[in-house]
């Protein structure tokens, strides 16, 4: 039994880090493997993660972590019974994938303006709380070509757009994701999408 693709890990910079790897053949990850992880400091405990299958030869482990701080560094040991398959380390602050934003809402009652709001996925004391920027994806359910991305580079989790920039009388969906430039994070997953019917008064044309 060998590791084909070494574990790579990402942290939500709060409570979970997720490690994925591939074995050299079909593996019952939860039965055959254990990932041990330990914070590097004196008297720290070793924790055991039981991996789950992620495709035939793929394994994934969710490592529970206390509040992450930038200095945290973990040793990782992948075991198959008594055999050490791989040894490595992981610094959560250097491999951050933010949590996905939540509670995306489209407010259509403002005159001819769409207001999209969502919630910051971090509590105020978390470092990422004040460092997230967002991308909002809006698309038409009727027309696959009607697909747009709005970059929200300010901190407020909201976006205003004129309803007239979208077609009237059809349904649209929106979703939002986050990233933090300060930690050069990857993008978060997209939030669940929300749907609304876009309608606005066409301006009266004089002939």
């Amino acid at each position: 039994m060998k590791v084909l693709q070494e574990p790579t890990c990402v942290s939500d910079y709060m409570s979970i880090s997720t490690c994925e790897w591939k074995m050299n053949g079909p593996t019952n990850c939860s039965r055959e493997l254990r990932l041990l992880y330990q914070l590097v400091f004196l008297l720290s405990e070793a924790h055991t993660c039981i991996p789950e299958n992620n495709g035939g030869a793929g394994c994934v482990c969710h490592l529970l972590m206390d509040d992450v701080v930038s200095a945290d560094n973990y040793t990782l040991d992948l075991w198959a019974g008594q055999q050490l398959l791989w040894k490595g380390s992981f610094k959560p602050s250097e491999h951050v994938k933010p949590r996905a934003p939540g509670n995306l809402t489209v407010h259509t009652n403002v005159s001819d303006t769409l207001l999209l709001t969502w919630s910051n996925p971090y509590p105020p004391d978390n470092y990422l709380y004040n460092h997230l920027t967002y991308a909002v994806n809006i698309w038409s359910e009727n027309d696959p070509a009607d697909f747009r991305i709005y970059n929200v580079t300010y901190l407020e989790p909201s976006l205003r757009i004129a309803a007239s920039t979208l077609k009237s009388g059809i349904s649209y969906r929106a979703r939002v994701r986050a990233w933090a430039q300060c930690y050069n994070t990857t993008w978060s997953e997209w939030s669940p999408s929300t749907k609304w019917h876009n309608s606005y008064r066409e301006p009266f044309e004089q002939h």
């Epitope: 409570s15 979970i16 914070l39 400091f41 004196l42 008297l43 720290s44 405990e45 789950e52 969710h62 529970l64 972590m65 206390d66 509040d67 992450v68 701080v69 949590r99 996905a100 939540g102 509670n103 996925p121 509590p123 105020p124 004391d125 997953e189 939030s191 669940p192």
Partner: antibody, heavy 115, light 107 residues
């Protein structure tokens, strides 16, 4: 091994105060965020409060906000819950529980609020 | 605040039965969900975290699934020591909230 021992519970009248303590051993307390969780007699679990190891930030359940204060003394390996303006509905066994996500619990201390 | 609704609140089952308990969150919590077991007079112990990750030392007959707002705890073959009360917990945001509990009793 990890051990959490709560104390300070007892009988108190409505409107009174009580201070609970939780002494930790078997791990580096200063490196752990901590929680208080309670359970009223014959009822379910209710999270009460949290204190971060990283920032010292605190969070509370709405039911205790403004009345309870969580604190810690890393030099004494101790977690505290100062409970003021106690009500009948605060009667419960109070547990301290360690992060991440309540991996270790103390045995609990019973708080009875009654006249 | 996020509400966690567990069902059923109580159930009777026999040794060897497959038992399923569900937990519904009032809003999306991704996979930030844990399951705890509590026996009478004892302290709760964590069975599952991150919706589907088995806690080390917990028998493999316990499994968790779900994401978003719908979650399930399954005991594949109920053993005598499994008669207890089970709680789900969301830790996606503060305040953290437990489900009201499911008591699994002997039929």
């Amino acid at each position: 091994q990890v051990q959490l021992v709560e104390s300070g519970g007892g009988l108190v009248q409505p409107g009174g105060s009580l201070r609970l303590s939780c002494v930790a051993s078997g791990f580096t307390f200063s490196h752990s965020s901590m929680n208080w969780v309670r359970q009223a007699p014959g009822k379910g679990l209710e999270w009460v409060s949290y204190i971060s190891r990283a920032t010292g930030a605190v969070y509370y359940a709405d039911s205790v906000k403004g009345r309870f204060t969580i604190s810690r003394d890393n030099a004494k390996n101790s977690l505290y819950l100062q409970m003021n303006s106690l009500r009948d509905e605060d009667t419960a066994v109070y547990y301290c529980a360690r992060e991440p996500v309540f991996d270790y619990w103390g045995q609990g201390t019973l708080v009875t609020v009654s006249s | 605040d996020i509400q966690m609704t567990q069902s059923p609140s109580a159930m009777s089952a026999s040794v060897g039965d497959r038992v399923t308990i569900t937990c519904r969150a009032s809003q999306d919590i991704s996979n930030y969900l844990a399951w705890f077991q509590q026996k009478p007079g004892k302290v709760p112990t964590r069975l599952i975290y991150a919706a589907s990750s088995l806690q080390s030392g917990v028998p493999s007959r316990f499994s968790g699934s779900g994401s978003g707002t719908e979650f399930t705890l399954t005991i594949s073959s109920l053993q005598p020591e499994d008669f207890a009360t089970y709680y789900c917990l969301q830790w996606s945001s503060y305040p953290r909230t437990f489900g009201q509990g499911t008591k699994v009793e002997i039929k």
